[in-house]
Interface confidence: medium
């Protein structure tokens, strides 16, 4: 084994290096000292380090480690942050287009139902947006509310346009009849199924991306333990105490130290792998009724079909509802 | 509800579906993201090695520092001596993860369970039921042009899935690129103190 080179007789090199870390030279001994008070860079002979220097080295080592960790995760963090934003924005745009398609369908096919229909459609798609954003909204309730609101307008404007104003207090009865008589057939149920499936997947997809950011942020801002700080100091800085400014840590030694410092972080690995693979499975399944783009952009067509269904059965329905809601003031249906 | 996004109705223009044709649909963008994420699948297990390779380590030098003394790079002492009598590395590992790491592991376990539940094939039975109940449009197949809407005036055809991603300015601005605003920049005198 080669003998260690003699330490700097005056600690001059050590001082000039340490000055960059800590302006002010009072902590660096003029000449090598026994260093009996040192706790980390335990000397084999005279040393150019003091206890205060050791503390500064420990602080710097931990800061270096934190910066290395942050630069390690920067590309990954940026990838997820950027995509979470892009997808949230894209989903909002899909919702906006879906609303516009639906409004256009009403304007072109059922102008007499506007502007009330616009209002109900607007509220429905607002709830869709808020659901994706994570608010506690029940999708079935959203769909029911849309059809409950639409039916009285359809009844009074399309099916029974000659209804006198005095009869317009039957709205509550009509809302109740809508469900009991299955006025729109199975279309509301179909929409519930498609919308809830697609929005659930969309919401979980966004949640997963945002959790990805949180995972990286958590490991990015880890504070390393004192033990780790001591290991890092010994690896990166203790050589300076002996005047060995240009020497670098051994590769195998670095790996052992890093594994020690990162034992906790590395425990995430198993769950991180599973996270990426599970997210891949989810993405592979996001088609047809599990694809909100596909479902929402086709909604106006299904709503159109549901209104046609009502019109097709208008005669029978008008008779039944006429009897059912004749005394709606005495008998509230819902 | 009184709380709703401002009205963005675009009237007749909507029927023209005048979106920029763009190769990237949402689904292709999702798949692209997954491919990129998969390149980071070993991110955490590779971290110790990554950090060693990005901090000063003896690569071509004959001698290296093992925490206590200068040794030859390929000697057994290169990894061992520096750890001896200093403190117990095993103890450090046995302490277990920080509370914040345990918390994030719990959240990962939870989302993984949710993701698996959502991806289960048995959750897909509904597709078949919908077909059987006759809700799928009979005239439109799964070809490139999917019909949105059946009959009546004002019905429109939309090219497969909307390629509206062009509307999203997701191309990175220079300011957003890694190394700029993302880069942590502590005080100069406290960082980048490695002496090479």
């Amino acid at each position: 084994q080669p003998p260690p080179p003699p330490p700097d007789a005056t600690c001059h090199q050590v001082r000039s290096f340490f000055q960059r870390l800590q302006p002010g030279l009072k902590w660096v001994p003029e000449t090598p000292v026994p260093g009996s008070d040192l706790q980390v860079c335990l000397p084999k002979g005279p040393t150019c380090c003091s206890r205060k220097m050791e503390e500064k080295y420990q602080l710097t080592a931990r800061l270096n480690m934190e910066q290395l960790l942050q630069s390690a995760s920067m590309e990954l963090k940026f990838l997820i942050i950027q995509n979470a934003a892009v997808f949230q924005e894209a989903f909002e745009i899909v919702v906006r287009h879906a609303k516009n398609y639906t409004n256009a369908m009403f304007k072109n096919n059922y102008p007499s139902l506007t502007p009330q229909a616009f209002e109900f459609v607007g509220e429905f798609f607002t709830d869709v947006s808020l659901y994706i954003l994570g608010s506690d909204i029940n999708v079935d309730d959203m769909v029911n509310e849309l059809f409950d609101s639409l039916f009285p307008v359809i009844y009074t404007q399309l099916m029974n346009p000659g209804l006198p104003d005095s009869a317009l207090d039957i709205n509550e009865c009509l809302r109740g009849a809508r469900r009991d008589l299955k006025v729109f057939g199975n279309f509301p149920k179909l929409i519930m199924t498609q919308v809830s499936k697609s929005l659930q997947v969309t919401r979980i997809f966004l949640q997963a991306l945002n959790l990805g950011i949180e995972v990286i942020n958590t490991t990015d801002h880890l504070k390393f333990s004192k033990d780790c700080g001591r290991m890092l100091t010994r690896m990166w800085y203790c050589s300076y105490c002996q005047g060995l400014m240009m020497v670098k840590p051994c590769g195998g030694y670095c790996n052992v130290v890093m594994q020690g410092c990162m034992a906790g972080v590395v425990e995430i690995d198993k769950y991180w792998r599973e996270y990426i693979l599970s997210l891949e499975e989810l993405v592979n399944g996001m088609y047809r009724i599990y694809d909100m783009e596909n479902v929402l952009l086709g909604l106006f067509s299904t709503i159109h079909d549901s209104i046609q269904y009502v019109q097709k059965n208008a005669g029978k329905l008008t008779t039944t509802i006429g009897k059912l809601c004749a005394h709606s003031q005495q008998r509230q249906y819902r | 509800s009184a709380y709703y996004p401002e009205d963005l109705f675009i009237d007749k223009k909507v029927l023209k579906v005048a979106h920029v044709e763009h190769e990237e649909t949402l689904s292709s963008r999702r798949r692209e993201l997954i491919q990129k994420l998969k390149s980071f699948i070993s991110f955490y297990s590779a971290l110790p090695g990554y950090i060693c390779s990005h901090s000063p380590v003896a690569e071509n030098d004959t001698l290296c520092w093992n925490g206590q003394e200068l040794v030859e790079r390929y000697s057994q002492k290169a990894a061992r001596n520096g750890m001896k009598n200093q403190f117990n590395l095993h103890e450090l590992k046995m302490k277990g993860p920080e509370p914040v790491v345990s918390q994030i592991i719990d959240k990962l376990k939870h989302i993984n369970q949710l993701l698996r539940t959502m991806s289960m094939p048995k959750g897909r039975v509904l597709d078949k039921n919908l077909d059987e109940e006759g809700f799928e449009s009979g005239d439109c197949g799964d070809d490139e042009d999917e019909c949105i809407g059946g009959s009546g005036d004002g019905m429109i055809k939309v090219k497969n899935q909307l390629r509206f991603l062009a509307e999203l300015a997701y191309d990175l601005d220079v300011d957003d690129a890694p190394g700029n605003s993302q880069q942590a920049t502590p005080k100069d005198n406290e960082i980048s103190t490695f002496h090479n």
Epitope: F78, I81, Q82, A84, A85, V86, Q88, E89, E92, I93, V95, R96, S129, L130, I132, L133, G134, S135, D136, I137, R203, L206, Q207, N210, L211, I213, E214 | S1, Y3, P5, E6, K107, H110, I111, E167, L168, A169, Y170, D173, D175, D176, S181, Q182
Partner: antibody, heavy 124, light 107 residues
Framework: QMQLVQSGGGLVQPGGSLRLSCAAS????????MNWVRQAPGKGLEWVSY????????YYADSVKGRFTISRDNAKNSLYLQMNSLRDEDTAVYYC?????????????????WGQGTMVTVSS | EIVLTQSPATLSLSPGERATLSCRAS??????LAWYQQKPGQAPRLLIY???NRATGIPARFSGSGSGTDFTLTISSLEPEDFAVYYC?????????FGQGTKVEIK
């Protein structure tokens, strides 16, 4: 260092207009939803408006709907609040706040970084 | 909208004492409740999110608990810099709402 620096407050008469600005730095602005929150003198906090990261959707509190417009310019890393038809009750300190996400409910109405605030006084 | 009621309105304590602040929601907000601290002339600062998780850089003396409709913010041992107004905020239902605040003042 992450920063949100606000400007544009002042004294305005009822019925008047004012435009608030919020300049962001130190983070990827275009990736975050942003909000305005206000605080009337001696009172609590009230959420005012929200805009998605790319600006495609905006939400408003009932009290300002139709009068206030939130917007953003991601190229300039800036957020704005255009306030029209101002009323006495709009007098408050207005804060811009970054919307953040922590895993759970999935919404972005959690405010992790705030501007220093700008005073808007509506008075004749 | 969900109404959050904080109690007490004012809490007079000495440094080193334990502070317990309460926030009650008019309906369940699950665990989606946050706590903010605001000092005079300053912007609010996020302390706790999702009922019990400390935000980045928040000292361990701050802790949150509760779920559903009843929540508590505890400051285990008050430091001089902790005297401020504390607000709770829910993000479970639309729109996001804040409590009216609890002022923690020096006795």
């Amino acid at each position: 260092q992450m920063q949100l620096v606000q400007s544009g407050g002042g004294l305005v008469q009822p019925g008047g207009s004012l435009r608030l600005s919020c300049a962001a730095s130190g983070f990827s602005f275009s990736s975050y939803a942003m909000n305005w929150v206000r605080q009337a003198p001696g009172k609590g906090l009230e959420w005012v408006s929200y805009i998605t990261s790319g600006g495609s959707s905006r939400y408003y509190a009932d009290s300002v709907k139709g009068r206030f417009t939130i917007s953003r310019d991601n190229a300039k890393n800036s957020l704005y609040l255009q306030m029209n038809s101002l009323r006495d009750e709009d007098t408050a300190v207005y804060y811009c706040a970054r919307g953040t996400y922590y895993y759970g409910s999935g919404n972005y109405f959690l405010f992790d970084h705030w501007g220093q605030g700008t005073m808007v006084t509506v008075s004749s | 909208e969900i109404v959050l009621t904080q109690s007490p309105a004012t809490l007079s304590l000495s440094p080193g004492e334990r502070a317990t602040l309460s926030c009650r929601a008019s309906q369940s907000v699950s665990s989606y409740l946050a706590w903010y601290q605001q000092k005079p002339g300053q912007a609010p600062r996020l302390l706790i999110y999702d009922a019990s998780n400390r935000a980045t850089g928040i000292p361990a003396r701050f802790s949150g608990s509760g779920s559903g409709t009843d929540f508590t913010l505890t400051i285990s041992s008050l430091e001089p810099e902790d005297f401020a107004v504390y607000y709770c905020q829910q993000r479970s239902n639309w729109p996001p709402t804040f409590g009216q605040g609890t002022k923690v003042e020096i006795k």
